[in-house]
């Protein structure tokens, strides 16, 4: 039993890390595998996580982790049984992968402004809290082409765009991801979509 | 709320041993944190003298090692100093504090602390 | 041991004023902390691992560094901070503090 590829990680910057790998042929993750992690500190004690499958040859284990700071770094071991696989270190802070932003409305009642908000997935407390800038997606369902971006570069989770910027009388769909560019950190996922129909009233034209 | 509290004889002569106990309240010894002794001289140097971890392993300050025991009772919530072989150079504000791997071992929890004189 | 030099020694600076300390370390550290006391009080933790500041510590107060050389800012000095600020290791044992930077105010 050998690594094909090495595990690679990625944390929330909150309480989990993911790690995954691949095998060399078909292995069943949760029975024959066991990764140890280890936070480089004093009082740390060695954690285990159980893996799991993904795909015929892939592992995934979720590291969970009380709290980060930056300057925090990890042990990994994998071991098969009684024989290391693989031996590593994890610095989180270098592998960030924001958690996705939720609970994602648009309110449509304000005098033809489509009004967008989403919540913050951090506590206060958490650095990434006030680090976090988003993009907003708003696409067409019946018009593929009509697909937008809206950068978010300040802090506050929403967005004000103009209805008449949209097409009247057609369902859109948004949803929203996140990232920090203080960790140079990959986008987080997408929010699960929200739909609406989008009217207006068309100005009145005067001949 | 989580509380500290020292209490000693605040008078020892040198070469008596010292003994110190610390209760701490709102939190239990066991579930977490290291449990430490540090003194402050009196022209305010701070010295970590040592721990005792919630699971009952010790670390001490090697200065110390010969003379200091860190103990406790977690029936009482207590954890205690031993120092042996005092001198008047140990003369100083002794505090108990935990700190845990949360905040990476920040002393989140200090007592007010008991002040210690070593004189014949 | 790891010793931990802080300067200055005392540090006088008039309210609204900007202040860096500094803590310079012999050895790399991991997780430097640091803590604020006040004459007859224990000392009180400000903040940790370096940049995360304790509970209760107002936003003014911000922490940097890395390796050897760590710093403690003030934004904007007030009466309110007059205290001494002394840092800390937990790299490796013994754990180690500085001697203190005393902040006065003009």
């Known amino acids: 039993m050998k690594v094909l590829q090495e595990p690679t990680c990625v944390s929330d910057y909150m309480s989990i890390s993911t790690c995954e790998w691949k095998m060399n042929g078909p292995t069943n993750c949760s029975t024959e595998l066991r990764l140890l992690y280890q936070l480089v500190f004093l009082l740390s004690e060695a954690h285990t996580c159980i893996p799991e499958n993904n795909g015929g040859a892939g592992c995934v284990c979720h590291l969970l982790m009380d709290d980060v700071v930056s300057a925090d770094n990890y042990t990994l071991d994998l071991w098969a049984g009684q024989q290391l696989l693989w031996k590593g270190s994890f610095k989180p802070s270098e592998h960030v992968k924001p958690r996705a932003p939720g609970n994602l409305t648009v309110h449509t009642n304000v005098s033809d402004t489509l009004l967008l908000t989403w919540s913050n997935p951090y506590p206060p407390d958490n650095y990434l809290y006030n680090h976090l800038t988003y993009a907003v997606n708003i696409w067409s369902e019946n018009d593929p082409a009509d697909f937008r971006i809206y950068n978010v570069t300040y802090l506050e989770p929403s967005l004000r765009i103009a209805a008449s910027t949209l097409k009247s009388g057609i369902s859109y769909r948004a949803r929203v991801r996140a990232w920090a560019q203080c960790y140079n950190t990959t986008w987080s996922e997408w929010s699960p979509s929200t739909k609406w129909h989008n009217s207006y009233r068309e100005p009145f034209e005067q001949h | 709320d989580v509380q500290l509290q020292e209490s000693g004889p605040g008078l020892v002569k040198p070469s008596q041993s010292l003994s110190l106990t610390c209760t701490v309240t709102g939190y239990s010894i066991t579930s977490d944190y290291a449990w430490n002794w540090i003194r402050q001289f009196p022209g305010n140097k701070l010295e970590w003298m040592g721990y005792?971890?919630?699971?009952?392993?010790?670390s001490y300050n090697p200065s110390l090692k010969s003379r200091i025991s860190i103990t406790r009772d977690t029936s009482k919530n207590q954890f205690f100093l031993q120092l042996n072989s005092v001198t008047t150079d140990d003369t100083a504000t002794y505090y108990c504090?935990?700190?845990?791997?949360?905040?990476?071992?920040?002393?989140?929890?200090w007592g007010q602390g008991t002040t210690l004189t070593v004189s014949s | 041991q790891i010793v931990l030099s802080q300067s200055p020694a005392i540090l006088s600076a008039s309210p609204g004023e900007k202040v860096t300390m500094t803590c310079r370390a012999t050895?790399?550290?991991?997780?430097m902390h640091w803590y604020q006391q006040k004459p007859g009080s224990s000392p009180k933790p400000w903040i940790y691992?370096?940049?995360n500041l304790a509970s209760g510590v107002p936003a003014r107060f911000s922490g940097s560094g890395s390796g050897t050389s760590y710093s403690l800012t003030i934004s904007r000095v007030e009466a309110e901070d007059t205290a001494t600020y002394y840092c800390q290791q937990w790299s490796s044992i013994p754990l180690t503090f500085g001697a203190g930077t005393k902040l006065e105010l003009k």
């Open positions: 504090a935990g700190g845990g791997l949360r905040r990476r071992g920040l002393f989140d929890y």
């Open positions: 005792i971890s919630y699971s009952g392993s010790s």
């Open positions: 050895s790399s550290v991991t997780y």
């Open positions: 691992a370096t940049s």
